[in-house]
């Protein structure tokens, strides 16, 4: 799926048009530590700051970052290299809003690689920027061992053999 430049969810005065709330976006942790439900209004928040970010053609813009959804399939390492060659990286999920945005724009039901793999050296799931996963937030189902890489499907993150071929998401 190649998406055109700009955001698929059109935001008008802080709200999203022609969009329904995603079923499983969970709760939003706000600065004071309390939680509240994520709504489409949240998804469109901070768009004013987004206006200065320019994304390349066929990249999708959201909250100051650019996203590209592949149409072909590659192994995790080939996907990793593909993103690097385009001065980007495999998707790093920073919060629930970003995950909700990704889910809304995944038009297929099959697996999609993200920038997360299990490093046997650290014995932990690690993002491609080197940061460890926050297990208080993220749950990954499946083997946690060498040659395990993470893919998303609908509202879930799975462990898959890194040599498997899936679509992927680049981000910068």
């Amino acid at each position: 799926l190649l998406v055109s430049q700009g955001v698929l969810l059109k935001c008008q005065k802080g709200s999203c048009s022609n969009a329904t709330q995603y079923e499983d976006t969970g709760d939003l942790k706000v600065n004071n530590g309390t939680r509240r439900n994520i709504s489409n209004k949240d998804l469109c928040a901070s768009r004013s700051a987004d206006q200065t970010v320019l994304c390349q053609s066929e990249w999708l813009k959201y909250q100051g970052k650019c996203y590209w959804f592949s149409n072909e399939m590659k192994s995790w390492s080939d996907s990793y290299v593909y993103c690097l060659e385009r001065k980007s990286h495999l998707l790093i999920i920073h919060d629930q809003l970003e995950m909700a945005f990704i889910q809304k724009n995944l038009r297929q039901l099959n697996y999609v690689w993200i920038g997360l793999n299990f490093t046997s050296l650290k014995m932990t799931w690690t993002w491609v920027d080197g940061s460890p996963i926050d297990s208080k937030i993220f749950f990954i189902k499946g083997p946690a061992k060498e040659n395990s890489c993470a893919a998303i499907k609908e509202s879930k993150i799975f462990s898959e053999t890194c040599s498997s071929v899936f679509k992927w998401i680049c981000q910068y």
Epitope: G26, F139, S155
Partner: antibody, heavy 114, light 113 residues
């Protein structure tokens, strides 16, 4: 196979650790849950030890239990038992694919009396 | 946490009859539901997972259906060996760890007359 151990008669407030010893599979491949059943009552989910060593709990169980593991055991610690914790404690293995959790293998249980 | 409500709490049917047990989730759990049979002094035995997939070795007299919040276990052509307590369990999870809780319904005692 799975085998629970460590259940015994304890006085209230005395921490107790239950052990689930596994064989024939790796804990890095399969998640493990703990479930308990008070005498004459239903099944009550406590928490899960995920394949990466992270533990997650039912809301009611947070702070009352901890789960840890070694390469062949999964331990459930009752931090400060009360009489309400009297139950048979079971461990069970997830044998499912990514699509579903499938808790098909269960231990025989170990009885805790507080 | 999601809450699982199971009805009825008990059911009595003759040999050869049919019993239907319902399980309702407090929020959508897709098709992530399991059914177990438990007899006194034994651990639960998995019958069905994924709402409708029969576990290997389980009689086809056991049938699971439903999705979202409403689920049903139907036991047809009842046998004396079916006398037990039956439980549903949510096995729904998501990437968000607070959703990874797997509660049981309250159980249904089935008596075969």
């Amino acid at each position: 196979s799975l085998e629970e151990s460590g259940g015994r008669l304890v006085t209230p407030g005395t921490p107790l650790t239950l052990t689930c010893t596994v064989s024939g599979f790796s804990l890095s491949n399969n998640g493990m849950i703990w479930v308990r059943q008070a005498p004459g009552e239903g099944l009550e989910y406590i928490g899960i030890m995920n394949t990466d060593g992270s533990a997650y709990f039912a809301s009611w169980a947070k702070g009352r239990f901890t789960i840890s593991r070694t390469s062949t055991t999964v331990d459930l610690k009752i931090t400060s038992p009360t009489t309400e914790d009297t139950a048979t404690y079971f461990c069970a293995r997830d044998a499912g694919s990514n699509d579903h959790f499938v808790f098909s293998l269960w231990g025989q249980g170990t009885l805790v009396t507080v | 946490d999601v809450v699982m409500t199971q009805t009825p709490s008990s059911a009595s049917e003759p040999v050869g009859g049919t019993v239907t047990i319902k399980c309702q989730a407090s929020e959508s759990i897709s098709s992530d539901l399991a059914w177990y049979q438990q007899k006194p002094g034994q651990p639960p035995k998995l019958l069905i997972y994924g709402a409708s997939t029969l576990e290997s070795g389980v009689s086809s007299r056991f049938k699971g259906s439903g999705s979202g919040t409403e689920f049903t276990l139907t036991i047809s052509d009842l046998e004396c060996a079916d006398a037990a307590t039956y439980y549903c369990q949510s096995t729904y999870y998501s990437w968000y760890s607070s959703k990874c809780v797997f509660p049981f319904g309250g159980g249904t005692e089935v008596v075969v007359k």
